[in-house]
């Protein structure tokens, strides 16, 4: 059985479209599961992995490796 584009698995009922945009950064494995690109995490691979050591409470990032501080916090790790 050959599945339609972006459909995977027995019965072709698993859907996965690789994407690299605002809504996700992932490839699809042979079973149609999302595999996050380097620097991204979460079920939709849309959460950037911040700079190692970046304060989870006072820092955040839109892009992998970043560490943007909340107002009132500073430093390489916003700590």
């Amino acid at each position: 059985v050959t599945c339609d584009d972006y459909y995977y698995g027995f019965g072709c009922n698993k859907f996965c479209r690789p994407r690299d945009d605002f809504f996700g950064h992932y490839a699809c494995d042979q079973n149609g599961n999302k595999t996050c690109m380097e620097g991204w995490m979460g079920p939709e691979c849309n959460r950037a992995i911040c700079r190692q050591g970046c304060s989870p409470k006072h820092g955040s990032c839109k892009l992998p490796g970043d560490c943007r501080c909340q107002y009132g916090w500073q430093g390489l790790y916003c700590d």
Partner: antibody, heavy 119, light 107 residues
Framework: QVQLVQSGAELKKPGSSVKVSCKAS????????MHWVRQAPGQGLEWMGA????????AYAQKFKGRVTLTADKSTSTAYMELSSLRSEDTAVYYC????????????WGQGTLVTVSS | DIQMTQSPSSLSASVGDRVTITCRAS??????LAWYQQKPGKAPKLLIY???TLADAVPSRFSGSGSGTDYTLTISSLQPEDFATYYC?????????FGGGTKLEIK
Amino acid sequence: QVQLVQSGAELKKPGSSVKVSCKASGYTFTDYEMHWVRQAPGQGLEWMGAIQPGGGGTAYAQKFKGRVTLTADKSTSTAYMELSSLRSEDTAVYYCTRRGYDDYPFAYWGQGTLVTVSS
Amino acid sequence: DIQMTQSPSSLSASVGDRVTITCRASGNIHNYLAWYQQKPGKAPKLLIYNAKTLADAVPSRFSGSGSGTDYTLTISSLQPEDFATYYCQHFWSAPWTFGGGTKLEIK
């Protein structure tokens, strides 16, 4: 279970701004972007934009760029939609909405917030 | 931007009828299409995603088909609770636009 609870109805004057809140529960707030959709009385659905609560990244429909601001407060799992320079055509029900778990679109919706713009 | 054209805009039918609503995208959306049902005063409810997959707890009388730019929602045997407005929406790329809606009324 996933729940999205929105703030109450608003009556605004033309030229003013409105800020609608959407409190999320039942899932990890930073795992999924929050989208905003509006519906004018008797009209169809219109996608306005989305925010990634984890990092604050945003995507906006061209029509709303410069007039809408999406923000998120991770500490309270609350997303906000602020619309400025209001005009009568902005009278609508505003919904926050979230994708489902398997890449399908808007499976979860807030109850909607009616914003009325009138002088 | 991809535009979605939905037809018809309104439709009168009777309980037990088979009903078809179509949606045409201005570009290939590769099955990235959803269908919603909305009743007055309520938020939309997801019926079908990825063009043909039924969302949780949606009755099997609803089905979706299509590919490329042309998609169809079919209700095989209308029930009284099915009278509502139906919307298609693509989610291939932002902006995720909706069709104009189809109001399904009792004949």
